[in-house]
Structures are given as C-alpha cells and as structure tokens.
Interface confidence: low
C-alpha cells in the first residue's frame, strides 16, 4: 500500500533541518528520506 | 462552527468488523490531514490511522495494519475507519482528529486542533 | 519504536506552578504539542510547536523542548486546569503520545 512518503525540500529552522513532509508536518531532527522524481535518495 | 461528529461505534464480537463515520463540518477533509486516535478505557491516547490530503497517502499503527483501513467520501465531508478482524484490545473511545495546517505555510507540524466528541467501541463475546 | 515518558501525577496547589515533563530521545530535535483532556471530555490542544499557544489558551500555559525532555509549565494553577496532560511528537511520519500525566490541584 502507499504509505507516506516525505517530499524533497528542506529548510532551516531555529538552526535545526525541517524537512517538508507534506500532510503530516515537518520533522525538526535527523534525514528520514528525501523524494526526487519519485526516488527515495536518503 | 469547526466540528467534527463521529458515529458508528457500538458491541462486537471479536473477529467482527465496524464501519465508524466522521462527518465534519465548516471545513473541507479533502484540505486536511485527518487522523484516527483511540483510547482504552482508563488509558492514553494511541494513534490509529492518517489519511493526508493526497488520499493516495496513508498510514496505519502496526497494532491495526492489515486489519483496519481508512477513507474519505469527499462529496459527502466525511472520513471512515473500516475496522475488521476486531480484537479485545481494539475496545476504546475513537476519536477523529484535524491536523492544524496553516496553509500559508503547509510543511509544518501544529498538532491536531479539531477533536469529535469520540465513539465507543467494544469488541467483546 | 519511539517511547514518550510522563510521570502519572503531578499534584500542585491553586495558584502555584506545575511543570509536566516529557522525557524521549532527542525529543528537541522533533516537534511537540500538549492536549489537556478532562474526564468524559475530547482532548484539547493547548501547546503546539514546542512552545506556542492556540488562541484562546491562558497565557499560563507554556512549554519548552530541548534535548531530551519537554515540558509543560502551568502559572498560577486554577482549579479548572485539574485535567491529564499529554505530549505528542513526531516519528518520522506518525505520531507518538506520552502516557499521560494527571494533574492534580490539591
């Protein structure tokens, strides 16, 4: 089933990684993956 | 009035299923993640199931996956939580739950600031 | 899996502070809100983002995250803020509750 994914995009937050994990919020801490055209990178 | 108003709990036996509804209303689902959170009786809060705006995208508790899914009828404003193959365990108030989303700024986390009044399920012989 | 820890009470009298803590792994490094849910009610948000208020919460209410524990501090408890407390966090894309804690105003 499709489960959620976290989308590419990230941005620095009070000198911490948010990452753009569309629908559920963003994550302050460590890289759970990053999407590009669809491929899970990291 | 942002509301959300939950039904279709009730007595099960185990192995049975349910159907729970929840109808929201002043806001669109379809716009919103939405979630399922349960609570035993005397218990905590435990997350169910998450449906986010993209309906293609969803995700379950290990304690539910494989046994329980989520929905929306977005024509009717209206998130389900299909839940089959019903445990002792499974008894407990479900909730359902908006994600705050500021939409200006839609990547970040604000908690779930809508609640409905809850339904009670009880899986029992 | 990702474990959130509150103590199960925490008693205070009327108008002195109480501080609810929420101890997980590098919990700083996440996102947390609190809900305060009172018997036979639906939970309510009263801290979201580590440390902001929803409108219409007291200004009582407030919160901190940093390393490994957050916390919940209530100024000038009243009677009405006798409720259970948790704390909700982020892991990766689910959500974690603590426990929960029981206030107690003595």
């Known amino acids: 089933d499709a489960e959620f994914r976290h989308d590419s995009g990230y941005e620095v937050h009070h000198q911490k990684l948010v990452f753009f994990a569309e629908d559920v919020g963003s994550n302050k801490g460590a890289i759970i993956g990053l999407m590009v055209g669809g491929v899970v990178i990291a | 009035e942002v509301q959300l108003l939950e039904s279709g709990g009730g007595l099960v036996q185990p192995g049975g299923s349910l159907r729970l509804s929840c109808a929201a209303s002043?806001?669109?689902?379809?716009?919103?993640t939405m979630w399922w959170v349960r609570q035993a009786p005397g218990k905590g809060l435990e997350w169910v199931s998450?449906?986010?705006?993209?309906?293609?995208?969803?995700n379950y508790a290990d304690s539910v996956k494989g046994r329980f899914t989520i929905s929306r009828d977005n024509s009717k404003n209206t998130l389900y939580l299909q839940m089959n193959s019903l445990r002792a365990e499974d008894t407990a108030v479900y909730y359902c739950?908006?994600?705050?989303?500021?939409?200006?700024?839609?990547?970040?986390?604000?908690?779930?600031?809508?609640w409905g009044q809850g339904t009670l399920v009880t899986v029992s012989s | 899996s990702y474990e959130l820890t509150q103590p199960p009470s925490v008693s205070v009298s009327p108008g002195q502070t109480a501080s609810i803590t929420c101890s997980g792994r590098?919990?700083?490094?996440?996102?947390v809100a609190w809900y305060q849910q009172k018997p036979g009610q639906s939970p309510v948000l009263v801290i979201y983002?580590?440390?902001k208020r929803p409108s219409g919460i007291p200004e009582r209410f407030s919160a901190s995250n940093s390393g490994h524990t957050a916390t919940l501090t209530i100024s000038g408890t009243q009677a009405m803020d006798e409720a259970d407390y948790y704390c909700?966090?982020?892991?990766?894309?689910?959500?974690?509750f603590g426990g929960g804690t029981k206030l107690t105003v003595l």
């Open positions: 739950a908006r994600e705050w989303m500021d939409h200006s700024r839609p990547y970040y986390y604000y908690g779930m600031d809508v």
């Open positions: 002043s806001f669109q689902i379809s716009k919103n």
């Open positions: 998450v449906i986010g705006k993209d309906e293609t995208r969803f």
């Open positions: 590098n919990i700083g490094d996440s996102w």
């Open positions: 983002r580590d440390d």
């Open positions: 909700s966090s982020q892991d990766t894309v689910t959500r974690v």
